[in-house]
């Protein structure tokens, strides 16, 4: 789903008030409802008939410093005979999602948000048929 | 997918400077990537063979402000004839994603991160058979 | 983890009625089927009655008539009513028990019915 734009609206401060020095906001430490784990059935990539395989990427000056991407195994879905039946179509699922990025000069450390799109995993769907003029 | 614990780490500065004053970190304004959008299939949440729904939070004060919510239709998969089939379940699928959450007292404005669990779609899948003794 | 106790099963003679009872904790979700499957000796296990989402409810063509199946959602319980009992009802009855991905099999409770 998408995440819109800022219009630099959200952190800004109160019209009353001064503005931000130097385009910069203060960021508290720790992270709300860190603990919060996400409880899905187990390797439903591997049992969905619009079966995924997951990339790693991995980048030190990001938090998360991991992102899982999923990339479809066929064009198709698997039937129940579990052959490929391109009737039906393996679709991904995508979410607009934030990362933070770390940006530093020596001792000078400061963050920025950055948008990253996610392939999270992949569906069955009846495709769309199209007549080309 | 899981966002690891931040182990207070990434948002540190490197031993040799001195610490990050109150506990708080320079956020600079604007999002990277911002223009970047999802791109996919139109309407696979009722097109798919399990299908769902889409519920939105909104927040104000937490960025973005609106959280979309997926709901699976059914316990089943919707079959060729249209009917649901309860052999084949339709599964949620999680993200574990970054929103920002504002707290403001008058003038003073600052940010924190906040995790949040999203269900993104739905996908068909083949139930693990459990045998309760 | 996901617990299932059965009871209702016994020995009834032909005619009678016999009513079985299933509840399942544990785990519980908004999207669920109960019900229950068969197993006669020498014979694979088959569907007698389930209940998906304490709505819809699919039954055996042999069975039609004769069973019932309900269910109280606050309990997360099923139960399955057997009148008019035949001696072919003799089987091992097994509550299921199914929430997306996953599917619960109780242990099972003997019916036999006597003609």
């Known amino acids: 789903r998408k995440i819109p734009k800022v219009g630099h609206t959200f952190f800004q401060k109160p019209e009353s008030c001064p503005p931000v020095p130097g385009g910069s906001m203060k960021l508290d430490i720790g992270i709300i409802n860190e603990n919060q784990r996400v409880s899905m059935s187990r390797n439903i990539e591997s049992r969905s008939t619009s079966p995924w395989n997951y990339t790693v990427t991995w980048d030190p000056n990001r938090y998360p410093s991991e992102v899982v991407q999923a990339q479809c195994r066929n064009l198709g879905c698997i039937n129940a005979q579990g052959k490929e039946d391109i009737s039906m179509n393996s679709v991904p699922i995508q979410q607009e999602t934030l990362v933070v990025r770390r940006k530093h000069q020596g001792c000078s450390v400061s963050f920025q948000l950055e948008k990253v799109l996610v392939t999270v995993g992949c569906t069955c769907v009846t495709p769309v048929i199209h007549h080309v003029q | 997918r899981k966002i690891p614990k931040v182990g207070h780490t990434f948002f540190q500065k490197p031993e040799s400077c001195p610490p990050v004053p109150g506990g708080s970190m320079k956020l600079d304004i604007g999002i990277i990537n911002e223009n970047q959008r999802v791109s996919m299939s139109r309407n696979i949440e009722s097109r798919s063979t399990s299908p769902w729904n889409y519920t939105v939070t909104w927040d104000p004060n937490r960025y973005p402000s609106e959280v979309v919510q997926a709901q699976c239709r059914n316990l089943g998969c919707i079959n060729a004839q249209g009917k649901e089939d309860i052999s084949m379940n339709s599964v949620p699928i999680q993200q574990e994603t970054l929103v920002v959450r504002r707290k403001h007292q008058g003038c003073s404005v600052s940010f924190q991160l906040e995790k949040v669990l999203v269900t993104v779609g739905c996908t068909c899948v083949t139930p693990v058979i459990h045998h309760v003794q | 983890e996901v617990q299932l106790v059965e009871s209702g099963g016994g020995l009834v003679q032909a005619g009678g009625s016999l009513r079985l009872s299933c509840a399942a904790s544990?785990?519980?979700?908004?999207?669920?089927?109960m019900g229950w499957y068969r197993a006669a000796p020498g014979k694979q296990r088959e569907l007698v009655a389930i209940?998906?989402?304490?709505?819809?409810?699919n039954y055996a063509d042999s069975v039609k008539g004769r069973f019932t199946i309900s269910r109280d959602s606050a309990k997360n319980a099923v139960y399955l009513q057997m009148n008019s009992l035949k001696p072919e009802d003799t089987a091992v009855y097994y509550c299921?028990?199914?929430?997306?991905?996953?599917?619960?099999w109780g242990q099972g409770t003997q019916v036999t019915v006597s003609s």
């Open positions: 299921y028990y199914n929430i997306p991905g996953d599917v619960y």
């Open positions: 544990g785990v519980i979700f908004r999207l669920n089927a």
């Open positions: 209940i998906v989402n304490g709505g819809s409810t």
